[in-house]
Interface confidence: medium
C-alpha cells in the first residue's frame, strides 16, 4: 500500500530466450533506471524481490524458487533459468525495497521455440561486415556469465542449417567466426551453439545473428547527385507543372546520416510562399548503398518561378554537395501575322 516508484512495463527490453536452454536475466533497474548498482543497494540494506504475471493472466504471483534442481534461482541481481520452459513466458517484475524506499520495473520475457535449422520468431541482431575488406570476425553473443572461465565449452557454428566446415572464406575459431573476405554470398543467418557442463548436466546456448555484407569504407565516396545535371534543361511555359527530381547516391557509411534537401532562391521551400510540394523515396542496393530521390513539384508554375534558382543539396559523413537545376521559360513561337507585319515594315 505504501508508494513505490513504478517504472511500468519496460517493453523496450523485450527479452526472448530459447526453450530448454539456460537464461540469465539481469534486473533492468540497475542498468537503465537507477543511478546505483546492485552492490551499493545491497550494502544499503535494500532487498531485491522478484515476481511475475503469467501470459494472459492479470495476477502477480511470486516466483517459485523451490523447483527441482533449482530450475529457477536468483543470484544477486540476476534471475536464472536452468533451463527455461515454454510456460515461463510472462511479465517479470523486479522490486528493490526496504522500509523507506521502493522502486520496481516490469519487463516481458518470451520463451521461444526453434526448429532443427534454428528458425524461430526470435528477433535477430544484425552484424554488418564490409565487403572485400580483409579479415573480419563475429563473436557468439550474450554468453558471458553462463559458465566460469575454468570451463571450456564446445562451440559449433552453422550457416543456416549447415555446419560450417571447409567453407571457402569462413573459418570457425572458438567463440569467433572469421570471414577472410566478406562477399554478398556470405549474407545470411549464422548460429553458434555453445555446449557446457554444469553440476553433472549438459546445457546448450543457441545464439543466431544475421550477417549483412555492406559497402566498404574503402569504396565510400561523397554523395553523387545524378539529377539535376548539366544535360537536362527544364523548359516550361507559365501554367505548366514543373517537376524536378533530385536523385542522389550515397555510399554506405556506418552510422552516417544521409540528407537531401532543396533550396529555392537560397531558402528552404517551407520558408517561401510558392505552392511547392516535395516527395521523397529511398531505395537501397544489395550492399546498403542508398539512392534518395526528392521530387520538387510546382503544379502551375509562374514566369516568376521560372526565374528562380532551384538547388538540390546532399550531405553525408563523406561531405556535402549541391547542384542547380537548369530552369528556363519556353520562348513562345512567333505568331504568323506579327511576322508578316514586321516583314512589311509595320511598326
Amino acid at each position: 500500500s505504501e508508494r513505490c516508484d513504478d517504472w511500468g512495463l519496460d517493453t523496450m527490453r523485450q527479452i526472448q530466450v530459447f526453450e530448454d536452454e539456460p537464461a540469465r536475466i539481469k534486473c533492468p533497474l540497475f542498468e537503465h533506471f537507477l543511478k546505483f548498482n546492485y552492490s551499493t543497494a545491497h550494502s544499503a540494506g535494500l532487498t531485491l524481490i522478484w515476481y511475475w504475471t503469467r501470459q494472459d493472466r492479470d495476477l502477480e504471483e511470486p516466483i517459485n524458487f523451490r523447483l527441482p534442481e533449482n530450475r529457477i534461482s536468483k543470484e544477486k541481481d540476476v534471475l536464472w533459468f536452468r533451463p527455461t520452459l515454454l510456460n515461463d513466458t510472462g511479465n517479470y517484475t523486479c522490486m528493490l525495497r526496504n522500509t523507506t524506499y521502493c522502486s520496481k520495473v516490469a519487463f516481458p520475457l518470451e520463451v521461444v521455440q526453434k526448429d532443427s535449422c534454428f528458425n524461430s520468431p526470435m528477433k535477430l541482431p544484425v552484424h554488418k561486415l564490409y565487403i572485400e575488406y580483409g579479415i573480419q570476425r563475429i563473436t557468439c553473443p550474450n554468453v558471458d556469465g553462463y559458465f566460469p572461465s575454468s570451463v571450456k565449452p564446445t562451440i559449433t557454428w552453422y550457416m543456416g542449417c549447415y555446419k560450417i566446415q571447409n567453407f571457402n572464406n569462413v573459418i570457425p575459431e572458438g567463440m569467433n567466426l572469421s570471414f577472410l573476405i566478406a562477399l554478398i554470398s556470405n549474407n545470411g543467418n549464422y548460429t553458434c551453439v555453445v555446449t557446457y557442463p554444469e553440476n553433472g548436466r549438459t546445457f546448450h546456448l543457441t545464439r543466431t545473428l544475421t550477417v549483412k555484407v555492406v559497402g566498404s569504407p574503402k569504396n565510400a565516396v561523397p554523395p553523387v547527385i545524378h539529377s539535376p545535371n548539366d544535360h537536362v534543361v527544364y523548359e516550361k511555359e507559365p501554367g505548366e507543372e514543373l517537376l524536378i527530381p533530385c536523385t542522389v547516391y550515397f555510399s554506405f557509411l556506418m552510422d552516417s546520416r544521409n540528407e537531401v534537401w532543396w533550396t529555392i532562391d537560397g531558402k528552404k521551400p517551407d520558408d517561401i510562399t510558392i505552392d511547392v510540394t516535395i516527395n521523397e523515396s529511398i531505395s537501397h542496393s544489395r550492399t546498403e548503398d542508398e539512392t534518395r530521390t526528392q521530387i520538387l513539384s510546382i503544379k502551375k508554375v509562374t514566369s516568376e518561378d521560372l526565374k528562380r534558382s532551384y538547388v538540390c543539396h546532399a550531405r553525408s559523413a563523406k561531405g556535402e554537395v549541391a547542384k542547380a537545376a537548369k530552369v528556363k521559360q519556353k520562348v513562345p513561337a512567333p505568331r504568323y501575322t506579327v511576322e508578316l507585319a514586321c516583314g512589311f515594315g509595320a511598326t
Epitope: 569504396n219 565516396v221 553523387v224 547527385i225 545524378h226 539529377s227 545535371n229 544535360h231 537536362v232 534543361v233 527544364y234 523548359e235 517537376l243 524536378i244 527530381p245 536523385t247 547516391y249 555510399s251 523515396s281 548503398d289 539512392t291 530521390t293 521530387i295
Partner: antibody, heavy 123, light 112 residues
Framework: QVQLVQSGAEVKKPGASVKVSCKAS????????MNWVRQAPGQGLEWVGQ????????YYAQKFQGRVTMTVDTSTSTVYMELSSLRSEDTAVYYC????????????????WGQGTLVTVSS | DIQLTQSPSSLSASVGDRATITCRAS??????????MHWYQQKPGKAPKLLIK???DLESGVPSRFSGSGSGTDFTLTISSVQPEDFATYYC??????????FGQGTKLEIK
C-alpha cells in the same frame, strides 16, 4: 518490380513514319533516362537516342538526327520513339532500355530492357 | 566517336570450359575510380541482359562465374566455367560522355 512493355510489331512502307511506345512501371519513371536501341536482323546493337522524362530533354545519335523524335507522357509513364522517312535498312527490332544509377556520376549501364518491337519496312 | 572492337567474333567452348571475350575501345573510357564499360548477354529472340557494369561489378542476380576486368581501353569478360545456358551472344557497351553510347559488334559463344 521494374517492367518495360513495348507496343506491338509494325509493318510500314518506305517513306512512312512509325511510332513505338514503351510503358514503364515499378520505379519512379521521371527520374531515369530512357534509351532506344535497335537491332537489324542478324546484326548487332545500335543506340538510337535517349530521353529524360522529367524534362523531356533528348539526345539522339548523329545518324538519326532529323529523323527521330522521342517524346514522353508522364501521366501514363510512357515514352515514344517516332522514326520518319523510313527506308528498308530501318527494318529492325527496337528496344527501350532504362539507364541505371550508380555511385558514379555518368557513364550509366542499361539495366532493364523492353521485350522489343519489330518494325518491318517493305514496299 | 569511340569505337569498340570485340574479339573473337565467335568462340566455341564446351560445358565446363573457361571462356574469355575482350573488348578494345578506340580511346580510354576510364576516369579516376571507374570505367564506363558494360557487358550484356543476348539469347536469340530475347532482349539483351546486363551482366557486368562499370567493367567489373556483377549485376544483381547474375551468377558469380561471370566476371569482368580491365580499365582504360582494354576490357575482358570471363566465364570461369561455361554452363549450357551461357551459349549466347555477348556485347560490350560504353557510355563514356553523355550523350553517345556505342556497342561492340558482338561475340557469339557456341557449343563446341
Amino acid at each position: 518490380q521494374v517492367q518495360l512493355v513495348q507496343s506491338g510489331a509494325e509493318v510500314k512502307k518506305p517513306g512512312a513514319s512509325v511510332k513505338v511506345s514503351c510503358k514503364a512501371s515499378g520505379y519512379i519513371f521521371i527520374t531515369y533516362w530512357m534509351n532506344w536501341v535497335r537491332q537489324a536482323p542478324g546484326q548487332g546493337l545500335e543506340w538510337v537516342g535517349q530521353i529524360f522524362p522529367a524534362s523531356g530533354t533528348t539526345y539522339y545519335a548523329q545518324k538519326f538526327q532529323g529523323r527521330v523524335t522521342m517524346t514522353v507522357d508522364t501521366s501514363t509513364s510512357t515514352v515514344y520513339m517516332e522514326l520518319s522517312s523510313l527506308r528498308s535498312e530501318d527494318t529492325a527490332v527496337y528496344y527501350c532500355a532504362r539507364t541505371d544509377f550508380y555511385r558514379y556520376d555518368g557513364g550509366y549501364a542499361l539495366d532493364y530492357w523492353g521485350q522489343g518491337t519489330l518494325v518491318t519496312v517493305s514496299s | 566517336d569511340i569505337q569498340l572492337t570485340q574479339s573473337p567474333s565467335s568462340l566455341s567452348a564446351s560445358v565446363g570450359d573457361r571462356a574469355t571475350i575482350t573488348c578494345r575501345a578506340s580511346q580510354s573510357v576510364s576516369t579516376s575510380g571507374y570505367s564506363s564499360m558494360h557487358w550484356y548477354q543476348q539469347k536469340p529472340g530475347k532482349a539483351p541482359k546486363l551482366l557486368i557494369k562499370y567493367a567489373s561489378d556483377l549485376e544483381s542476380g547474375v551468377p558469380s562465374r561471370f566476371s569482368g576486368s580491365g580499365s582504360g581501353t582494354d576490357f575482358t569478360l570471363t566465364i570461369s566455367s561455361v554452363q549450357p545456358e551461357d551459349f549466347a551472344t555477348y556485347y560490350c557497351h560504353h557510355s563514356w560522355g553523355i550523350p553517345m553510347y556505342t556497342f561492340g559488334q558482338g561475340t557469339k559463344l557456341e557449343i563446341k
